[in-house]
């Protein structure tokens, strides 16, 4: 029950996280005009990964897309790439985790397969979250660098007669959305990995085998078999006592998970 809850919660948290990463990637407010200690302007600038916008006091907002690839800063391209990789990995992770959910029955899928899928999706969520956090952090670092550079050159002029105020940009809402979303995806991924450990079928060390001897059936107790070594070992159990003559109906039944005699 706890495993199912952990897996389900991990899935939901990751889903929210990935939705947040997508939202952050699409948002225009990655950087917003710094209003602190600046002349109050009737025009407000903000920028995203895909376009820059200007909101006037008149209420009109004008957005212009970055219609160039080569002309864009390498850092911006890197941030775009990180966010897209995060989204793609997260989306694949979600798809895989849907089939891995314990509460969903798909054919005769083994628990071991579900465990593997849970682990795979968990790792994907972790990487997705890290990509988002990395992308947002790179952009934030870029902003901080540019902020202090523009502060140093804030007032430039011709012989000190005319002042040209340089627009400074600070953290936009998308950065915080991205950090939180990346964190949630990461947490969801960790939860999936934890759930995977509980889902993995622990093979019993001693397996019972029903053995039919001639004349009457004798059930041999597990003591008559060598213990398999190690977790999940494929070592075949060797029979060390062969009692009685075999008849045509003699059957050695290999135990299923629930077949303990």
């Amino acid at each position: 029950m706890a495993v199912t809850a952990c897996q389900g919660l991990g899935f939901v948290v990751s889903l929210i996280g990935i939705a947040g990463i997508i939202a952050a990637t699409c948002m225009d407010q990655w950087s917003t005009q710094d209003l602190y200690n600046n002349p109050v302007t009737a025009v407000f600038n903000y920028q995203g990964l895909w376009r820059s916008c200007v909101r006037e006091s008149s209420g009109f907002t004008e957005c212009r897309g970055y219609f160039t690839l080569l002309g864009l800063p390498a850092m911006l391209q890197a941030v775009r790439a990180l966010m897209i990789v995060g989204i793609v990995l997260g989306a694949i992770g979600l798809l895989v985790s849907i089939f891995a959910l314990k509460c969903i029955r798909i054919g005769s899928m083994e628990d071991s397969a579900k465990a593997n899928m849970t682990l795979t999706s968990g790792i994907m969520f972790i990487v997705s979250g890290l990509c988002a956090i990395a992308g947002v952090s790179v952009f934030a670092n870029m902003l901080v660098t540019n902020f202090w550079m523009s502060t140093a050159n804030m007032y430039t002029g011709m012989g000190g007669m005319v002042q040209t105020v340089q627009t400074r940009y600070t953290f936009g809402a998308a950065l915080f959305v991205g950090w939180v979303a990346g964190g949630l995806t990461l947490i969801g991924g960790v939860m999936m990995c934890i759930a995977c450990r509980g889902l993995a079928p622990e093979e019993t060390n001693y397996k019972a085998v029903s053995y039919h001897a001639s004349g009457h059936s004798v059930a041999y107790k597990p003591g008559g078999f060598k213990a398999s070594t190690g977790f999940g070992s494929n070592t075949k159990n060797k029979k060390i006592y062969d009692g009685g003559a075999r008849t045509e109906d003699e059957v050695q039944s290999y135990p299923s998970k629930h077949d303990y005699v």
């Epitope: 005009q33 002349p39 109050v40 302007t41 009737a42 025009v43 600038n45 903000y46 920028q47 820059s52 916008c53 200007v54 006037e56 006091s57 008149s58 209420g59 009109f60 004008e62 212009r64 005319v162 002042q163 040209t164 105020v165 340089q166 627009t167």
Partner: antibody, heavy 118, light 113 residues
Framework: QIQLVQSGSELKKPGASVKVSCKAS????????INWVRQAPGQGLEWMGW????????TYAEGFTGRFVLSWDTSVSTAYLQISSLKAEDTAVYFC???????????WGQGTLVTVSS | DIVMTQSPDSLAVSLGERATINCKSS????????????LAWYQQKPGQPPKLLIY???TRESGVPDRFSGSGSGTDFTLTISSLQAEDVAVYYC?????????FGGGTKVEIK
């Protein structure tokens, strides 16, 4: 078409109050800000402040805080400029103007002359 | 506050001649976000409210004759009347729409010589 119609001229005594109205028509009142501009006799234009009827935001120029109050009534698509404790130097023509795309004043009221005299 | 300085204070031009009015702002009116200059030009005739001629420094308002043109960027702007007509006699104001408080120039009176 877009129209801003202002109330008529006012003659007031010093210390009194006046309320100038600016009725908007031909557009959605709450979508655009209304600015107020003062023009003293024989002088230039002086921006007083503006209101955004959509958001309720008001901004005043430095010399127009305290005695000057900008308000509006959405139900009648009207903006108001109220001046209290009138002084002789408040004698001027007061214009209202719509703030439009490009932060431009594209439509103006005809102006209201407020005369303060004892 | 941003100071808008207009020159000359008055201008007498012959009919059909070119009239040029200058406007200088104490700070740049160029917005880096959209590369637009937030400067407008208004015409005011006696007893009338101002009328918008030009916005964004060079964009002509609809219905304004094409003899009116605006130019300039940053801090220096110009309004040009390519061929002065009798009906152009008025006071012309420049106004910055970038910083609060919004401010107007002192005005330039255009007369016929």
């Amino acid at each position: 078409q877009i129209q801003l119609v202002q109330s008529g001229s006012e003659l007031k005594k010093p210390g009194a109050s006046v309320k100038v109205s600016c009725k908007a028509s031909g557009y959605t009142f709450t979508n655009y800000g209304i600015n107020w501009v003062r023009q003293a006799p024989g002088q230039g234009l002086e921006w007083m402040g503006w209101i955004n009827p959509g958001t309720g935001e008001t901004t005043y120029a430095e010399g127009f805080t305290g005695r000057f109050v900008l308000s509006w009534d959405t139900s009648v698509s009207t903006a108001y400029l109220q001046i209290s404790s009138l002084k002789a130097e408040d004698t001027a023509v007061y214009f209202c103007a719509r703030l439009y795309y490009g932060n431009r004043f594209d439509s103006w009221g005809q102006g209201t002359l407020v005369t303060v005299s004892s | 506050d941003i100071v808008m300085t207009q020159s000359p204070d008055s201008l007498a031009v012959s009919l059909g001649e070119r009239a040029t009015i200058n406007c200088k702002s104490s700070q740049s009116l160029l917005n880096s976000g959209n590369q637009r200059n937030y400067l407008a030009w208004y015409q005011q005739k006696p007893g009338q409210p101002p009328k918008l001629l030009i916005y964004w420094a060079s964009t002509r308002e609809s219905g304004v004759p094409d003899r009116f043109s605006g130019s300039g960027s940053g801090t220096d702007f110009t309004l040009t009347i390519s061929s002065l007509q009798a009906e152009d006699v008025a006071v012309y104001y420049c106004q910055q729409a970038y910083y609060y408080p919004l401010t107007f120039g002192g005005g330039t009176k255009v007369e016929i010589k």
